[in-house]
Amino acid sequence: SPSPVTPSPTLKELIEELVNITQNQASLCNGSMVWSVNLTAGMYCAALESLINVSDCSAIQRTQRMLKALCSQKPAAGQISSERSRDTKIEVIQLVKNLLTYVRGVYRHGNFRGLNDIFEAQKIEWHEHHHHHHHH
């Protein structure tokens, strides 16, 4: 019989881990560069595919394991790897921040349509952040 499979982390757990590793960080993994990916085409596999070659970076190992577990879900979960863009490289921390913004949108609203949603969410978060500091 197949080996037992560890249960997949929840979106909330992934968000908590992404917040944890990006908080107060200007860089991750010594500024390693990775391919920018289209998160709308199956965010877990797409993000994992970009991060596969980042080894020996303990800061993101837990994130990689979580993405692997989420990407391993059966097709009903819709984890479809995207057509790979090979024109833009970004820092690991930027990819992780993009993923965090995207996952937060999925967590809050149930779905996310694309880059416009990411930019809108970033604007909202910027506004929330500054509004928060203005009142406190």
Epitope: I52, S55, K74, P75
Partner: antibody
Framework: ELTLQESGPGLVKPSQTLSLTCVVS?????????WNWIRQRPGRGLEWMGY?????NYNPAFQGRISITADTAKNHFSLQLTSMTTEDTAVYYC????????????WGHGTSLFVSS | SYVLTQSPSVSGSLGQTVTISCSGT??????ANWYQQLPGKAPKLLVH???GRLSGVPDRFSGSESGNSAALTITGLQAEDEADYYC??????????FGSGTQLTILG
């Protein structure tokens, strides 16, 4: 039980374009799965060429001369490889992966392809 | 270019245990899948990257990982196990990558 069956010309001339089709039975060609082409040159190992999953992903070794398409109505997917040379003589396999990470769980028997003038 | 390294050949007697290894930097992140290719046949997936055996695969076959290496262990070798074995993992640039294959020979 899902079965995959490759069909092709068996022989092509150098510089010609190869067209192979993989007919799927017992299941549907949909973008929920990864529909792959893999080849094996004589006495060599396995070489992944690319997959279709609604979008496509190709091995850079074939970039610029490979195209994988699917006809979901006819329940098959196809490989086109241009500018054939004798180095492309191989057995060509189609295979399905049900998740990106978990490997290719269903394979066709393979079709032998010779490139010769 | 990214390489998955396998030893070219391994041998064992009937009933023995053999281990086939595969190393590559991305194995530590995503693991490896293992395939068996009997002479003249299509490859067959045995063990996937979470260590789970495919339906119908005997429990004599098992997969494991340690760091950037994966291993396929076959216990109680049988004559029908004589085949080529391939590991397969992933690379950001290259996509799916296969190891060069290990030929298992059954002695005696």
């Amino acid at each position: 039980e899902l079965t995959l069956q490759e069909s092709g010309p068996g022989l092509v001339k150098p510089s010609q374009t190869l067209s192979l089709t993989c007919v799927v039975s017992g299941g549907s060609v949909t973008s929920n799965y990864y529909w792959n082409w893999i080849r094996q040159r004589p006495g060599r190992g396995l070489e992944w060429m690319g997959y279709w999953t609604g979008s496509t992903n190709y091995n850079p070794a074939f970039q610029g001369r490979i195209s994988i398409t699917a006809d979901t109505a006819k329940n098959h997917f196809s490989l086109q490889l241009t500018s054939m040379t004798t180095e492309d003589t191989a057995v060509y396999y189609c295979a399905r992966a049900s998740t990106w990470l978990h490997g290719m769980d269903f394979w066709g028997h393979g079709t032998s392809l010779f490139v010769s003038s | 270019s990214y390489v998955l390294t396998q030893s070219p050949s391994v041998s064992g007697s009937l009933g023995q245990t053999v281990t086939i290894s595969c190393s590559g930097t991305t194995i530590g992140v995503v693991g490896a899948n293992w395939y068996q290719q009997l002479p003249g046949k299509a490859p067959k997936l045995l063990v996937h990257s979470d260590g789970g055996r495919l339906s119908g695969v005997p429990d004599r076959f098992s997969g494991s990982e340690s760091g950037n290496s994966a291993a396929l262990t076959i216990t109680g070798l049988q004559a029908e196990d004589e085949a080529d074995y391939y590991c397969q993992s992933f690379d950001t640039t290259l996509g799916y990558v296969f190891g060069s294959g290990t030929q298992l020979t059954i002695l005696g």
